[in-house]
């Protein structure tokens, strides 16, 4: 069962999924000059049984002013409803995420592919968040969200995750300060711009989390 | 052009209230988090309230919870912040803030004045 909604955006922090559960769907996107190719899958999928899962289609694409050369990329089709979008990832990731049962690990980036990604996520994805260069985090319990089917329908939990004031980046446990992105420039001179790449797996939140200020509520 | 601006500041008297109001346009509007910070003169600003996108989560600092409250109309491309209770220290300028993680955006309106005094 597809999630019906993004995972929710809490200002100033980003979020990526560590693994993802069997069903989950990413929309095959090429880079700006490049066009999927008219026999390419729509999207890869997470595929597979209890003891191995992995992406099934691959995408393809082919240069816009050429006709028959193609490459393996990620394309882009024509803009759709924005969903789940996620900053390009690195393929580097934490070795107990291939052994979660049922689960795929990111995909390996191709050669011009797209700078974001495209996921349908499915019940019982969760995503972990992490605040953004130059904002610290206030915790009040685990800064992710799981996707849950509650009478007939999908939510998203609550992230307990407050990023504020412009000091410290948060990070997850062992985790190296993220650089700066190189791709293109923020949108407001006010923007942080930082990639979300080699989050690692968060069990349980560290024992000196601080003491939120703040407060939650579901509206 | 990406657009927020800030209406319904003004002075009020203590105990009085406000509701401040955030119009959005040039972005998809619902797939911003929303949120409100204060600055106060000689002070950082600070975040007061937010709203995740669907569905709709709130969050606010301790010193406003019970008093204000934060929503959104999607349909109006306008976030609120219903300010009850006020008390001079809510003496601030109030900035409404529009984020999304990926792609990128990071909006900030040019605030509205609030001043509670008698």
């Known amino acids: 069962e597809l999630c019906d909604d993004d995972p929710p955006e809490i200002p100033h922090a980003t979020f990526k999924a560590m693994a993802y559960k069997e069903g989950t769907m990413l929309n095959c996107e090429c880079k700006r000059g490049f066009r999927r190719i008219k026999s390419g899958s729509l999207y890869m999928l997470c595929t597979g049984n209890s003891s191995h899962s992995s992406w099934d289609n691959q995408c393809q694409c082919t240069s816009s002013a050429t006709r028959n050369t193609t490459k393996q990329v990620t394309p882009q089709p024509e803009e759709q409803k924005e969903r789940k979008t996620t900053e390009m990832q690195s393929p580097m990731q934490p070795v107990d995420q291939a052994s979660l049962p049922g689960h795929c690990r990111e995909p390996p980036p191709w050669e011009n592919e797209a700078t974001e990604r495209i996921y349908h996520f499915v019940v019982g994805q969760m995503v972990y968040y992490q605040c953004v260069q130059g904002y610290r985090a206030l915790h009040r319990g685990p800064a992710e969200s799981v996707c849950k089917m509650t009478h007939g329908k999908t939510r998203w939990t609550q992230p307990q995750l407050i990023c504020t004031g412009e000091m410290e980046t948060s990070q997850f446990p062992g985790e190296e300060k993220p650089q700066a992105s190189p791709e293109g420039r923020p949108e407001s001179e006010t923007s942080c711009l930082v990639t979300t790449t080699d989050f690692q797996i968060q069990t349980e939140m560290a024992a000196t989390m601080e003491t939120s200020i703040f407060t939650t509520e579901y509206q | 052009d990406v657009q927020l601006v800030e209406s319904g500041g003004g002075l009020v008297q203590p105990g009085g209230s406000l509701r401040l109001s955030c119009a959005a346009s040039g972005f998809t509007f619902s797939s911003y988090a929303m949120s409100w910070y204060r600055q106060a003169p000689g002070k950082e600003r600070e975040l007061v309230a937010y709203?995740?996108?669907?569905?709709?989560?709130?969050t606010y600092t301790d010193s406003v919870k019970g008093r204000f409250t934060i929503s959104r109309d999607n349909a109006k491309n306008t976030v609120y912040l219903q300010m009850n209770s006020l008390k001079p220290d809510d003496t601030a300028v109030y900035y409404c803030?529009?984020?999304?993680?990926?792609?990128?955006?990071?909006?900030w309106g040019q605030g509205t004045q609030v001043t509670v005094s008698s």
């Open positions: 709203i995740t996108t669907s569905p709709g989560y709130t």
């Open positions: 803030n529009a984020w999304r993680g990926a792609p990128r955006g990071d909006y």
